[in-house]
């Protein structure tokens, strides 16, 4: 019998390399049975995860999974960091693994490295 616990499918040590100025959607895949849980995003600040209140969010429904989406319209340099989603289910809090955004702050659109360049310069993601 399939478990009816809420599950959040963010992979351990997942990350996204993105550019400041681009739109980006950070998705939290949520599996639930009867009632969709309340889901929130937080951003890690040291060991504390600070709840992102009042941000642009939405839900997307697919066949067997829902996605709680945090929208970046667009990405800002300050968005660099690690994020976690959590679900409130039967008075319990279920937390996802954290996912990290590596934001490259390109000062001019013409300076943007190509995908090939990015692949050959992984250190750029961490600068």
């Amino acid at each position: 019998k399939e478990s009816c616990d809420v599950q959040l499918y963010i992979k351990r040590q997942s990350y996204h390399s993105i550019f400041a100025g681009d739109p980006f959607k950070l998705e939290c895949p949520v599996k639930y049975c009867a009632h969709r849980p309340q889901v929130t995003w937080c951003k890690l600040n040291g060991t504390t995860c600070v709840k992102l209140e009042g941000r642009h969010t939405s839900w997307k429904q697919e066949k067997n999974l829902s996605f709680f989406i945090l929208h970046f319209e667009p990405v800002l340099p300050s968005d660099n960091g690690s994020y976690r989603c959590s679900a409130n289910f039967l008075s319990a809090i279920i937390e996802s693994h954290s996912t990290t955004l590596y934001v490259t702050d390109v000062k001019s659109a013409s300076e943007r490295p190509s995908k090939d360049e990015m692949a050959s310069r992984p250190w750029l993601l961490y600068s």
Epitope: A20, G21, G54, R55, H56, T57, S58, P74, L76
Partner: antibody, heavy 117, light 107 residues
Framework: QVQLVQSGAEVKKPGASVKVSCKAS????????IHWVRQAPGQRLEWMGW????????KYNDKFKVRVTITRDTSASTAYMELSSLRSEDTAVYYC??????????WGQGTTVTVSS | DIVMTQSPDSLAVSLGERATINCKAS??????VAWYQQKPGQSPKPLIY???YRYSGVPDRFSGSGSGTDFTLTISSLQAEDVAVYYC?????????FGQGTKLEIK
Amino acid sequence: QVQLVQSGAEVKKPGASVKVSCKASGYTLTDYTIHWVRQAPGQRLEWMGWIYPGSGNTKYNDKFKVRVTITRDTSASTAYMELSSLRSEDTAVYYCARRNYYAMEYWGQGTTVTVSS
Amino acid sequence: DIVMTQSPDSLAVSLGERATINCKASQNVFTNVAWYQQKPGQSPKPLIYSASYRYSGVPDRFSGSGSGTDFTLTISSLQAEDVAVYYCQQYSTYPYTFGQGTKLEIK
């Protein structure tokens, strides 16, 4: 404190272009998007587009896409909105606004553009 | 485009009384709605974001509620300085769109 100061009123003939400036102070221009919104007499506010000054990336309302160009000069901490092929219905007050993650938080004082032959 | 429809178009309320302005979106905008106040000859001033979060410095007599397609701005006890036009705005889907405005006056 954060301030957005816009250029002065303009009177233009139909078919001409207008370029409105928005000078930011009290924060780093490249940290937030600048949006442009207009308000024609007796009409609702109308969102035109935004620029992310760090990279120059822009997003436009399709209604204005072929006629509007939003640019920035980071060294002057200034964003610009140019609207071409002006017609009488473009007569409006044009606002720049700084958006944080939520709403348009700080607004310029507005620039009145009058299109008249 | 998402159409934001406010009701009523104008509203007259006595000082100290409650004022309620409604905003209906033509499709689901989740909670991605802001409310602005605009006084004559001035730029819009943000009051509420994400449907119910008050901007710092905004008096707590202003409150917002709603999600999906139906939103409400409430002023719990009208003050003379609240006379203005109020606009809702959705930022869920491009292009961002505003309501037509509700003019609030003192009865």
